[in-house]
């Protein structure tokens, strides 16, 4: 279920844009980072893919949004929501949030000024 979003700008417009992009590379990139860099990711579908490759694919996808800058927070919130139930300890959730907030900078976008990554219902 999709939560209400849109601290900045037209939330319905951002929601449509976030829906249209493929956030899987971003999710995979962040999961790889919090699990620690290794020579090979045996449990990943593209075995030779390194975190940096996923990062580039992630940045490319985020760039597909018409208003990347304005809708960045909504995209980050959706990634958080998608992965929330996978994270079963408090430190890992904090680590995931930190990596998520670093994402715009890694992609050479401006970080959203205010972006609440706490998923509704207190799940993350």
């Amino acid at each position: 279920m999709r939560r209400e979003r849109g601290r900045q700008g037209d939330s319905s417009s951002c929601e449509r844009q976030v829906d249209r992009v493929n956030l899987k590379p971003c999710e995979q990139h962040i999961m790889q980072r919090i699990m620690g860099e290794q020579e090979q990711y045996d449990s990943y579908d593209i075995r030779s893919t390194r975190s940096s490759d996923q990062q580039q694919r992630c940045c490319d996808e985020l760039n597909e949004m018409e208003n990347t800058q304005r809708c960045m927070c909504e995209a980050l919130q959706q990634i958080m929501e998608n992965q929330c139930d996978r994270l079963q300890d408090r430190q890992m959730v904090q680590q995931f949030k930190r990596e998520l907030m670093n994402l715009p900078q890694q992609c050479n976008f401006r970080a959203p000024q205010r972006c609440d990554l706490d998923v509704s219902g207190g799940r993350c």
Epitope: D42, S43, Y44, D45, I46, N82, R86, D89, Q91
Partner: antibody, heavy 118, light 111 residues
Framework: QVQLVESGGLVVQPGGSLRLSCEAS????????MHWVRQSPQKGLEWVSL????????EYADSVKGRFTISRDNSKNSLYLQMNTLRADDSAFYFC???????????WGQGTLVTVSS | DVVMTQSPLSLPVTPGEPASISCRSS???????????LDWYLQKPGQSPQLLIY???KRASGVPDRFSGSGSGTDFTLKISRVEAEDVGVYYC????????FGPGTKVDIK
């Protein structure tokens, strides 16, 4: 090292209630999701319930939903399972289990035996 | 519900020889985040289960490197490169993609 010690297992009649406890040590208890898993010769290993580190979210197997309640007291490093309307097929060893952080079970207690019989 | 099956259900082994256990799920265990949610546990006689392999292929802390996990989608394998006497017990696979479901177990004993 991580230690999980279960208690409270007894012989109880069908329809009865029981409360299991698990005392945890050797790790920061209030950082981790905790689970109950049971094991019987009939059903093998069966996940029962989980509770997030702060108690904000609980989940149950369909077979125990509405009858069992998981809870925790982080100030006491303790996990609980309140079992009501017990049935014969609830008879099993009940293990207290720590989540490793990504939905795998990295530490198990020694188990406590629950027998539901008239 | 995701149903887990294992084969063989019983595996007599010779110390020093390799051994392999197969686990199959009724649906793919690959999440959108790229991780396969499949773990392996060993329950030695009279003991609680212990984690061997998590997320498809990652060896748990303290687990000897003779144990390895592989596979993708619905088919997974646990390999022991050289079986030792202490490896006897029941091996279980478990999926954690949707809630948690264990396989029926594979009993490994010495021939």
């Amino acid at each position: 090292q991580v230690q999980l010690v279960e208690s409270g297992g007894l012989v109880v009649q069908p329809g009865g209630s029981l409360r299991l406890s698990c005392e945890a040590s050797g790790f920061t208890f209030d950082d981790y999701t905790m689970h109950w898993v049971r094991q019987s010769p009939q059903k093998g290993l069966e996940w029962v319930s989980l509770i997030r580190w702060d108690g904000s979210r609980t989940e149950y197997a369909d077979s125990v939903k509405g009858r069992f309640t998981i809870s925790r007291d982080n100030s006491k490093n303790s996990l609980y399972l309140q079992m009501n309307t017990l049935r014969a097929d609830d008879s099993a060893f009940y293990f207290c289990v720590k989540d490793g952080g990504l939905r795998y079970f990295d530490s198990w207690g020694q188990g406590t035996l629950v027998t539901v019989s008239s | 519900d995701v149903v887990m099956t294992q084969s063989p259900l019983s595996l007599p082994v010779t110390p020093g020889e390799p051994a392999s256990i197969s686990c199959r799920s009724s649906q793919s265990l690959l999440h959108s985040n790229g991780i396969h949610y499949l773990d392996w546990y060993l329950q030695k006689p009279g003991q609680s289960p212990q984690l061997l392999i998590y997320l498809g292929s990652k060896r748990a802390s303290g687990v000897p490197d003779r144990f390895s996990g592989s596979g993708s989608g619905t088919d997974f394998t646990l390999k022991i490169s050289r079986v030792e006497a202490e490896d006897v017990g029941v091996y279980y696979c478990m999926q954690s993609l949707q809630t948690f479901t264990f396989g029926p177990g594979t009993k490994v004993d010495i021939k």
